[in-house]
Interface confidence: low
């Protein structure tokens, strides 16, 4: 229904603190490098506004868009041409212009150093301070360079790192505590971003029909027992909740996000028999829940997909006469039956089966053209299945880092025009499929593997589109959104490439190298992989790892011995000459 | 949906005490704040004091060290106990759930006249 002021139902609806919690997130995700106590200004500004108008919805203003209302409080900032160059002309258009022209200026890879965790104990002393300002911070600094996180789950996020604080800090030892819960945190969270990138890429590329198809796959595969029309209006209602968080409409989103959780919880026999757990839960725990729940029992009587797509006289008559609906429901029945495939794999099978009718149905005999369909998905489905077993086995085979090492050496000789860090942040990210998913059982595997992987790679495209430098990954990034995975898997090295010649500087490392965290070392060294493919791109497996293990024992040394300084500056020009002669 | 329904207020001389209770039911699962809020005539509904799910509470500068609030999860009920009583407290007291799944909710209210 319509109200009188939109930002007085919103504020009813969701209640001053997540109220106030969405306009930081869309502050934060709007103007990247405004301060946090720049941003609670104005969110203080806008939550008051909010209660007069909760008062009085005739007050002045109080009937306007939210996209007026938050415009024009970010056009308001001061300095913001000084800060923000071009953005600021974003203030000379009207709405819904102005809106989409800062959604146009957020950036995927804000100039922010990395979030660095304060030490547990700095850290419970401004938590027990001040709760709300803390909790405000960590939105602050992971919106700001998240501009697409689901605003709804980073209020999730935060309410899990504030349980985790009011724990580990009544602890003796806060830090053992904090460490692994607020890591675990943060690598969900962190999953979860590049996550919903990719359905921000997936509207704003290609629709909400591409959306809605992939909601219908997934809604499908968890809630096999739901009818067509339930999985349809599911489907439907989630691609309106992701489309409101993707435009920056956030109240909107947290707001129908709760509705449709809550018309689930309602309708739990039309849905699942599984979501009662998630449907006890409090707050932001239950849609979060809701989100990841296990898929349901499949029914055992499930006739063949055969004999409504294929056997069936009537196949064109009825594509012909609605084919979303034709296609949805072949998508929705295929989808049930396959909750071990991949979103991605099952959308490239109902495309295939599009393609086929749309052919076939325009020929003489159209049962005897379309008839081999299904046989026809069985490369289709073969190819990511080879993929995870051949990857899974090299995880197994490496561990996490030497994972990653290799496909450090792959993406590289792939694209090697790509920068060196966005070249070192893939690759890690990549391997840490083997972790997440060839642990999992076998019917679980490629769904994990290849829905992961192609949310890596979308944040692969986004970065590449900022300075396009690689031929290879600009035509795997301008198909569609499921195709990209296997386009990448296909690649080979690049043969127009011209080597990089060879800088001592490059390889050249100093004794600050060895008080640097774990993490911190693995990025060094995976940068000088990186380097060392682009010096030499036809480098076998064989010769770089020759170099890496003589690189790896010769950081051992050096940061073992008592002069640190004298050893890099003594053996690291023996190392980068052992280098040289090895990849010769 | 939460529904509330408030009791004990009352007339009370300047200097006394009085206590709201507010009991909650529906899907008091969903409640995450609880608070009080008061309307004194011809102004605007001010909080009053609040209580997370976590236990953390929160007073108006107006009423600190003078009224407590508490929550009983288990009985899902909201008490309001005011002491030290004074004749600006007079409003119509009103308790208030929020909830992140369904849109808040308010009770009818209920009278506290402070008045020699």
């Known amino acids: 229904e319509a109200h009188k002021s939109e930002i007085a139902h919103r504020y009813n609806d969701l209640g001053e603190q997540h109220f106030k919690g969405l306009v930081l997130i869309a502050f934060s995700q709007y103007l990247q490098k405004c301060s946090y106590d720049e941003h609670a200004k104005l969110v203080q500004e806008v939550t008051d506004f909010a209660k007069t108008c909760v008062a009085d919805e005739s007050a002045a203003n109080c009937d306007k868009s939210l996209h007026t209302l938050f415009g024009d409080k970010l056009c308001a900032i001061p300095n913001l041409r000084e800060n923000y160059g071009e953005l600021a002309d974003c203030c000379t258009k009207q709405e819904p212009e102005r809106n989409e022209c800062f959604l146009q200026h957020k950036d995927d890879n804000p100039s922010l150093p990395p979030f660095e965790r304060p030490e547990a104990e700095a850290m419970c002393t401004s938590f027990k301070e001040n709760p709300t300002t803390f909790m405000g911070h960590y939105l602050h600094e992971v919106a700001r360079r998240h501009p697409y996180f689901y605003a709804p789950e980073l209020l999730y996020y935060a309410e899990q790192y504030n349980e985790i604080l009011t724990q580990c800090c009544a602890e003796a030892d806060k830090e053992s505590c904090l460490t692994p819960k607020l890591d675990g945190v943060k690598e969900k969270a962190l999953v979860s971003s590049v996550r919903q990138r990719m359905k921000c890429s997936s509207m704003q590329k290609f629709g909400e029909r591409a959306f809605k198809a992939w909601a219908v796959a997934r809604l499908s595969q968890t809630f096999p027992n739901a009818d067509f029309a339930e999985i349809t209006k599911l489907a439907t209602d989630l691609t309106k909740v992701n489309k409101e968080c993707c435009h920056g409409d956030l109240l909107e989103c947290a707001d129908d996000r709760a509705e449709l959780a809550k018309y689930m919880c309602e309708n739990q026999a039309t849905i699942s028999s599984k979501l009662q757990t998630c449907c006890d839960k409090p707050l932001l725990k239950k849609a979060h829940c809701l989100s990841e729940v296990e898929h349901d029992t499949m029914p055992a009587d499930l006739p063949a997909i055969a004999a409504d797509f294929v056997e069936d006289q009537e196949v064109c008559k009825n594509y012909a006469e609605a084919k979303d609906v034709f296609l949805g429901t072949f998508l929705y029945e295929y989808s049930r039956r396959h909750p071990d495939y991949s979103v991605s794999l099952l959308l490239r099978l109902a495309k295939k089966y599009e393609a086929t009718l749309e052919k076939c149905c325009a020929e003489a005999n159209p049962p005897a053209c379309y008839g081999t369909v299904l046989a026809e998905f069985q490369p289709l489905v073969e190819e990511p299945k080879n993929l995870v077993k051949t990857n899974c086995d090299l995880y197994e085979k490496l561990g996490e880092y030497g994972f990653q090492n290799a496909i450090l050496v792959r993406y590289t000789q792939k694209a090697p025009q790509v920068s060196t860090p966005t070249l070192v942040e893939a690759a890690r990210n990549l391997g840490r499929v083997g972790t997440k998913c060839c642990t999992l059982p076998e019917d679980q595997r490629l769904p994990c593997v290849e829905d992961y992987l192609s949310a890596i790679l979308n944040r692969v495209c986004l970065l590449h589109e900022k300075t396009p430098v690689s031929e290879h990954v600009t035509k795997c990034c301008s198909g569609s959104l499921v195709e990209r995975r296997p386009c990448f898997s296909a690649l080979t090295v690049d043969e127009t490439y011209v080597p990089k010649e060879f800088k001592a500087e490059t390889f050249t490392f100093h004794s600050d190298i060895c008080t640097l965290p774990e993490k911190e070392k693995q990025i060094k060294k995976q940068t000088a992989l990186a380097e060392l493919v682009k010096h030499k791109p036809k480098a076998t497996a064989e010769q770089l790892k020759t170099v890496m293990d003589d690189f790896a024992q010769f950081l051992d040394t050096c940061c073992k011995a008592a002069d640190k300084d004298t050893c890099f500056s003594t053996e690291g020009p023996n190392l980068v000459t052992r280098c040289k002669d090895a990849l010769a | 949906q939460v529904q509330l329904v408030e009791s004990g207020g009352g007339l009370v001389q300047p200097g006394g005490s009085l206590r709201l209770s507010c009991a909650a039911s529906g899907s008091t699962w969903s409640i995450n704040t609880l608070a009080w809020y008061r309307q004194a005539p011809g102004k605007q509904r001010d909080l009053v004091a609040r209580i997370s799910s976590g236990g953390s509470t929160h007073y108006a500068d107006s009423v600190k060290g003078r009224f407590t609030v508490s929550r009983d999860n288990a009985e899902n009920t909201l008490v309001l106990q005011m002491n030290s009583l004074k004749p600006e407290d007079t409003a119509v007291y009103y308790c208030?759930?929020?909830?992140?799944?369904?849109?808040?909710?308010w009770g009818q209210g209920t009278q506290v006249t402070v008045s020699s």
């Open positions: 208030y759930a929020q909830s992140t799944w369904y849109p808040p909710s």
